[in-house]
């Protein structure tokens, strides 16, 4: 009688991550007695999968029973597959001895290669906001996947970003890789809507790739241009002396009036108007009854926006081409919550 | 018990080969691979490959390959390591341990033998 | 290759005291390592397997632990026969490859 093989059909087996992996393995001969084992790999460090004579493999069933005294089919299954599974299985047949049974034969092994999506991309920012022209850099990470190949690009508002560079670890053989990516972005003052997209393509999701995305909105810092402007109102002894302040993000901004270099008010942006950009402009302004002066006033616009140091814009207040009233050195303070008369 | 006898001491000429043995008993010979180690005078340990006696099967290290040569008599549950174009850099003390005929934590390098001390000089 | 950097490579300790060895995994070995233990006659014998087990009639102030990718031999209470050398090996991935080695010598 021709000697026992053991045959592996399958050369590869591709399984996807939480599926069942059918490794098949069948014997040409009952003869010699023995079992049957299952190894993940080869040499002294191989992996015992299962084995028929005894032992407690949870993971592991038989696709046919195996105490049926002519059964020569020693297929087993797998379930629940990750990718630390991924690797070549060998079906072997040892012959009963005595003390220990003794290996008689091997299969040729079959190759179980694992597939796994990739995690959900995660972009994250720099730390600090930045103003418009610098340069920001943004990391884009997903993890888990198997095979290696992957595929990643990143995108300001639909438009393909070409200055970045990316890793995908470890550089050898591995269960499942990770990649990060870093991309540099210059930024515009019209970038508070803009969104910065890394996109990840596998063969496991089957070309509909994930998307990270991060908002621009919480990278950039416009910072605001003032304007000090005048012009009469009410009584000829009172000027309205507006600041405006405008194209800022974000909202987050604290004005101070200086009257000749003395705080006079400050005040927290409240009720601020937006632009279509996203950026915000809001005014502020103040009652100045010019009697109450003998010199030329100073007054000073002083903002500071999101922590930043202030920036101010001055207007001198030619008292000398304003009437006099005598004797009106008080003024009462208007109760309007952007205004304020100054004496 | 399990125990490895290993052959004795060489003192061997540049350019030539020893073999050396390690002679196993207490245990199933078939059921285990035999790896070798060297250890240079005062320094560490190397793996140097192993042997599985069912087939014949052998793994080396990669800088001992060509260098080493492993075999078994199954018969005799002995082991044999020959080194080949001696140089100064083999003398050495060169140890067999074992390990399962899988990766089963408790078996690995348990038993080693005493060390054959191989010394290369003109 | 994995390599194994053993830490310290000397060490002069007294009777008593409390020590540890380590050795740090250039990549995942999971917990397949071992310490093994070097008399000056060039035995060898092994202590600790997968980590953490200790081998049977090894004392038991003998303790092996790990974090991330460091082991640690951890001997509590040296006693005169434990100044020999200690090696770390890794069974994890051909080739095995051992630690430099720790010499435990007495203070």
């Known amino acids: 009688e021709e000697e026992l093989q053991v045959i592996q059909p399958d050369k590869f087996v591709l399984v996807a991550a939480g599926e069942t992996a059918t490794l098949r393995c069948t014997a040409t001969s009952l003869i010699p007695v023995g079992p049957i084992q299952w190894f993940r790999g080869a040499g002294p460090g191989r992996e015992l999968i299962y084995n028929q004579k005894e032992g407690h493999f949870p993971r592991v069933t038989t696709v046919s029973d195996l105490t049926k005294r002519n059964n020569m089919d020693f297929s087993i299954r797998i379930g629940n597959i990750t990718p630390a599974d991924a690797g070549t299985y060998y079906c072997v047949k040892f012959r009963k001895g005595s003390p220990d049974d003794v290996e008689f034969k091997s299969g040729a092994g079959t190759e179980l290669s694992v597939r796994a999506k990739p995690s959900a991309p995660v972009v994250s920012g720099p730390a600090a906001r930045a103003t418009p022209q610098h340069t920001v850099s943004f990391t884009c990470e997903s993890h888990g996947f198997s095979p290696r190949d992957i595929t990643l690009k990143w995108f300001k508002n639909g438009n393909e970003l070409s200055d970045f560079q990316t890793n995908v670890d470890p550089v050898g053989e591995s269960v499942s890789y990770s990649i990060h990516s870093t991309a540099k972005v210059v930024l515009t003052r019209e970038d508070v809507h803009s969104q910065v997209i890394c996109e990840v393509a596998h063969v496991t999701l089957q070309g509909d790739p994930l998307r990270g995305t991060a908002n621009l909105s919480e990278t950039i810092r416009v910072p605001p241009t003032l304007e000090v402007t005048q012009q009469p109102v009410r009584a000829e002894n009172q000027v309205n002396v507006t600041c405006q302040v405008r194209k800022f993000y974000p909202q987050r901004l604290q004005l101070t009036w200086l009257e000749n270099g003395n705080v006079s008010r400050t005040e927290t942006a409240s009720t601020v108007t937006e632009n279509k950009d996203g950026t915000y402009n809001w005014m502020s302004w103040l009652l100045v009854n010019v009697s109450a002066h003998r010199d030329d006033v100073k007054l000073t616009c002083q903002v500071e926006h999101d922590g930043q140091p202030a920036v101010s814009k001055s207007h001198d207040l030619k008292v000398s081409a304003h009437p006099k009233e005598q004797g009106s050195n008080t003024a009462a303070e208007n109760t309007g919550s952007n205004e304020r008369n100054i004496y | 018990e399990v125990q490895f006898q290993q052959s004795g001491t060489v003192l061997a000429r540049p350019g030539t080969s020893v073999k050396m043995s390690c002679k196993a008993s207490g245990s199933t010979f078939t059921s285990y691979w035999m790896h070798w180690v060297k250890q240079g005078p005062g320094q560490g340990l190397q793996w140097i490959g192993a042997?599985?006696?069912?087939?014949?099967?052998?793994t080396y290290n990669q800088k001992f390959k060509g260098k080493a040569e492993l075999t078994v008599v199954t018969s005799t549950s002995t082991a044999y390591m020959e080194v080949s174009s001696l140089t100064n850099e083999d003398s050495a003390v060169y140890y067999c341990?074992?390990?399962?005929?899988?990766?089963?934590?408790?078996?690995?390098?348990?038993?080693w033998g005493q060390g054959t001390l191989v010394t290369v000089s003109a | 290759d994995i390599q194994m950097t053993q830490s310290p490579s000397s060490l002069s300790a007294s009777l008593g005291e409390r020590v540890s060895l380590t050795c740090r995994a250039s990549?995942?070995?999971?917990?397949?390592l071992n310490w093994l233990q070097q008399e000056p006659d060039g035995t060898i014998k092994r202590l600790i397997y997968?980590?953490?087990s200790l081998d049977s009639g090894v004392p038991k102030r003998f303790s092996g632990s790990r974090s991330g990718s460091d082991y640690s031999l951890t001997i509590s209470g040296l006693e005169s026969e434990d100044f020999v050398d200690y090696y770390c090996?890794?069974?994890?991935?051909?080739?095995?490859?051992f630690g430099g080695g720790t010499k435990l010598e007495i203070n």
């Open positions: 990549q995942d070995i999971g917990s397949r």
């Open positions: 341990t074992r390990s399962f005929y899988y990766s089963l934590d408790a078996a690995w390098f348990v038993y």
């Open positions: 090996l890794q069974y994890a991935s051909s080739p095995f490859t």
């Open positions: 997968a980590t953490s």
């Open positions: 042997i599985y006696p069912v087939n014949n099967d052998t």
